[in-house]
Each structure stands twice: as structure tokens, then as C-alpha cells.
């Protein structure tokens, strides 16, 4: 305030504007621009202890251009806002605030969460998973022959990973026990994995029993045909109904 004492603005007429710089329409030695040429924005620029008027084609960061008939100026964004479109619509908030619908908030509203990278309030994203893929072939120690009881597995993909406050993903792998008619491995089949075998229709009489397993086994493979008599088929249908519980494991 002391700096202003004794330094006075002469009451001047706008047509006394000799020596005006750049976009000034009227000016004074002490104050710089007093008014601007059309379409330019008036702004106060600090030079040391002094503020002088300048005329700009666009406003600096932290300001937005206000236009009234024949008089434009750079107007400050709100205190919590770094860049704004107008007084009521912020486009980037100051540190510690989150942007939501043009406003800067300390905390995000209900149903939204803070993204600390973009510093915006964003919708909570819940996990989304695909449908289950078909069960893998019934295998034991990687083989699809030479055993009676084995395991089979199925998987599903994560389509949408959850955000911080979103619902966690459900299990993406399921494994269960399975039983097939014991079949000797043919010559050259020993050690072959299910995925190397020729795809065939699954056996109608196959029995499944769920077991917990954290291994991710081969997916989408079918079980080779097995010959069974009608009595065996009936027996297996009853077993299927009794053993339908499935235990899931997450990977």
C-alpha cells in the first residue's frame, strides 16, 4: 500500500494514447495498458512490486477470458482450480482436489471414487468376467488315458478389471474330479496331453466330482469316446446327480 502513495493516475482521455504498446487501446506510463483493442483481453501482470495492465490474445493459466460488449478481461478461476473454461466450470483442479462435473472437490461424491492419476472423480468400475469356457478333457498327470479318476478344469476371462472401490473379481478357474472308463494308452499315446489328442464328442456316461485345485489346466477340450453298456450308463447318471458340487479357485 505504501508503494501507491504519491504515485497518481492522471485523469486521462482515452484518445491520449501515444506510445501504447502492442494491443493497448489506451495506456499510461505508470499503469501500462488501461484498455485493450477489440478481441484482446485485459490482464494485470506483476512486475516486481508493481502490477501493470497488459493486453493478451488469450488468458494465462489460472484465468479465463470474460467477454462483455466491447470490454474483455482475464478473470481468475476459483481458488481451488488451476485451469477453467469459465467461473463455474473447472477443467483442472489444484493439488489435493478432485475434478467432478467442472467442480473441484475435497472428496468424491457417493458412488464415485478418486483417480489419483488424473485427479478426477470417476465411476466405480466393478469386475466383469466372461462366460465359462467348456470343461477341459479329463486328465491325470497330464494324460487322458491309463487312469480311471482324474480332474478337469474350466476357465473364464476377466473382461473388466475393477477399480479401487469396485467389486473384486469372482474365481476365474474351476477344477473338479472326473471319472472315465479305464482305458489303456495306445502305442505312442503314453504321456500325450489332452490338447494333443483328436477332438471327439464327450462320453454321455462320464461322471464328474468337484475338487479344489489351484492349477490352471488345459481348457476347451473334449473327452474321447468310451464304450459302455446300458447298465453302466444308468449307474453313472445317478452318480452325476450325487456329485454336482463344484469348488472354485481364483488365479
Amino acid at each position: 500500500q505504501n508503494a501507491s502513495r504519491g504515485r497518481r493516475q492522471r485523469r486521462m482521455h482515452p484518445n491520449v494514447s501515444q506510445g501504447c504498446q502492442g494491443g493497448c487501446a489506451t495506456c499510461s506510463d505508470y499503469n501500462g495498458c488501461l484498455s485493450c483493442k477489440p478481441r484482446l483481453f485485459f490482464a494485470l501482470e506483476r512486475i516486481g512490486m508493481k502490477q501493470i495492465g497488459v493486453c493478451l490474445s488469450s488468458c494465462p493459466s489460472g484465468y479465463y477470458g470474460t467477454r462483455y460488449p466491447d470490454i474483455n478481461k482475464c478473470t481468475k478461476c476459483k481458488a481451488d482450480c488451476d485451469t477453467c473454461f469459465n467461473k463455474n466450470f473447472c477443467t483442472k483442479c489444484k493439488s489435493g482436489f478432485y475434478l467432478h462435473l467442472g467442480k473441484c472437490l475435497d472428496n468424491c461424491p457417493e458412488g464415485l471414487e478418486a483417480n489419483n492419476h488424473t485427479m478426477e472423480c470417476v465411476s466405480i468400475v466393478h469386475c466383469e468376467v466372461s462366460e465359462w469356457n467348456p470343461w477341459s478333457p479329463c486328465t491325470k498327470k497330464g494324460k487322458t488315458c491309463g487312469f480311471k479318476r482324474g480332474t478337469e478344469t474350466r476357465v473364464r476371462e476377466i473382461i473388466q478389471h475393477p477399480s479401487a472401490k469396485g467389486n473384486l473379481c469372482p474365481p476365474t478357474n474351476e477344477t473338479r474330479k472326473c471319472t472315465v472308463q479305464r482305458k489303456k494308452c495306445q502305442k505312442g499315446e503314453r504321456g500325450k496331453k489332452g490338447r494333443e489328442r483328436k477332438r471327439k464328442k464327450p462320453n454321455k456316461g462320464e461322471s464328474k466330482e468337484a475338487i479344489p485345485d489351484s492349477k490352471s489346466l488345459e481348457s476347451s477340450k473334449e473327452i474321447p469316446e468310451q464304450r459302455e453298456n446300458k447298465q453302466q450308463q444308468k449307474k453313472r447318471k445317478v452318480q452325476d446327480k450325487q456329485k454336482s458340487v463344484s469348488v472354485s479357485t481364483v488365479h
Partner: antibody, heavy 119, light 107 residues
Framework: EVQLVESGPGLVKPSETLSLTCTVS????????WNWIRQPPGKGLEWIGY???????YQNPSLKSRITISRDTSKNQFSLKLSSVTAADTAVYYC?????????????WGQGTLVTVSS | DIQMTQSPSSLSASVGDRVTITCKAS??????LSWFQQKPGKAPKTLIY???RLVDGVPSRFSGSGSGTDYTLTISSLQPEDFATYYC?????????FGQGTKVEIK
């Protein structure tokens, strides 16, 4: 020295239109911004609106629907019309000018004219 | 619209006193503030603009300060001719609004 002088009837009937003129000397109204301001008796100041050097106008939104500001450059005058007046429009009406954000606002004022709204 | 709250609404002081009048804006007005003096039956007279710049012919006992939302007019040593009503005005955006006024009376 810039001088502004308001003129117009001192008494206006309710629902009629108040009309005032400001005559400017010492400067051209084709420079700067020419304003109307009013002050009800014993109360504070209220800005009404302006007409710019090019003839464009801006009015206080609280009065906008009733205000017309115009000018006559040949006479170096600008005018205020306020329609549908009521007793609440009784005030001293001033004209005043400024030249831009970097200079003094309302550096020059008219002496004011009292307008009474009464039947 | 930006509201300007001026205080006090009136004050009693003696010649030679230091007088302070404040104006608070409802939002940051970025130094676009003027102070006016009005005597009974007269038009207001501009004292200060852009927060702290004295208009030509205004005595240096008048000074202005402030930033953001808070602004002050100070009369360092009150003189007999200073007894009047003082108004602040913001011109950061339209519509322009004045404070309600502060009447400075003789104690």
C-alpha cells in the same frame, strides 16, 4: 476536464417510463464506457448498465427487461429508459464514465438527478 | 452476482484518528476494487482503483490494500473534510456491485 450532466423529468407516474439523458462535454462518447448508476434516498449505490464507445450495451440482469440505453453521437449524449416504474425506482440517477480496467472506474460523474415515482 | 459486504456500517472518530473500513467480496475479485467518498447531496468521488492506486488529486492519507476477497481502505489521519460515506465497488465482472457504505461521523 470531462463533464457529465443528467437531465429529465423529476416526477414519473407508476407504470410509466422514466427517461433521462446524459450530456457529455470534454470527451467523445465514441471513446470509453458510459454508465448509469442510481441511489434510492438514504440508501446505497446500484449500477444499472453501460453503453460502449461503439454503441453496444450491457445492463444489470436485475433490471435488464426494463432497461434501454441508447446514444446520440451527434449531440454527444446517451440516454436511459426504464419502463414500468414503481415507487422502488425512486432514486437519484447518475451518469458516470470509465475508460478501461487499468484506469480509475467512474472517474467522472454527473451531479445526479432525483426522479420520484408517484401518482 | 458477487456480493460486497462492507463494515462497519458506521463509525465515530475524531480528527487525527486512523480509520479503517473493510470490504469483503463473496469470491476472489483479483484486485478489481475501487473506493468512493460521497458527501450529502453530492455525487460520489473516486479515491482509489485497482485496490491501491490513488486517483490524481486524492490526498496520500488515503490508502488501499487487500487481495482475494478482503480489501481495506485506511485513512491514516482523519481530517474534517473526510467525514462522509465511503463505498467500495468491485469490477471484476458484470454486474458491478457496491458495498452498502460506511458512514464516518464526528465523535
Amino acid at each position: 476536464e470531462v463533464q457529465l450532466v443528467e437531465s429529465g423529468p423529476g416526477l414519473v407516474k407508476p407504470s410509466e417510463t422514466l427517461s433521462l439523458t446524459c450530456t457529455v462535454s470534454g470527451d467523445s462518447i465514441t471513446s470509453g464506457y458510459w454508465n448509469w448508476i442510481r441511489q434510492p434516498p438514504g440508501k446505497g449505490l446500484e449500477w444499472i448498465g453501460y453503453i460502449s464507445y461503439s454503441g453496444k450495451t450491457y445492463q444489470n440482469p436485475s433490471l435488464k427487461s426494463r432497461i434501454t440505453i441508447s446514444r446520440d453521437t451527434s449531440k454527444n449524449q446517451f440516454s436511459l429508459k426504464l419502463s414500468s416504474v414503481t415507487a422502488a425506482d425512486t432514486a437519484v440517477y447518475y451518469c458516470a464514465t470509465y475508460y478501461g480496467y487499468g484506469g480509475p472506474w467512474f472517474a467522472y460523474w454527473g451531479q445526479g438527478t432525483l426522479v420520484t415515482v408517484s401518482s | 452476482d458477487i456480493q460486497m459486504t462492507q463494515s462497519p456500517s458506521s463509525l465515530s472518530a475524531s480528527v487525527g484518528d486512523r480509520v479503517t473500513i473493510t470490504c469483503k467480496a463473496s469470491q476472489d475479485i483479483d484486485s478489481y476494487l475501487s473506493w468512493f467518498q460521497q458527501k450529502p447531496g453530492k455525487a460520489p468521488k473516486t479515491l482509489i482503483y485497482l485496490t491501491n492506486r490513488l486517483v490524481d488529486g486524492v490526498p496520500s492519507r488515503f490508502s488501499g490494500s487487500g487481495s482475494g476477497t478482503d480489501y481495506t481502505l485506511t485513512i491514516s489521519s482523519l481530517q474534517p473534510e473526510d467525514f462522509a460515506t465511503y463505498y467500495c465497488l468491485h469490477y471484476d465482472e458484470f454486474p458491478l456491485t457496491f458495498g452498502q457504505g460506511t458512514k464516518v461521523e464526528i465523535k
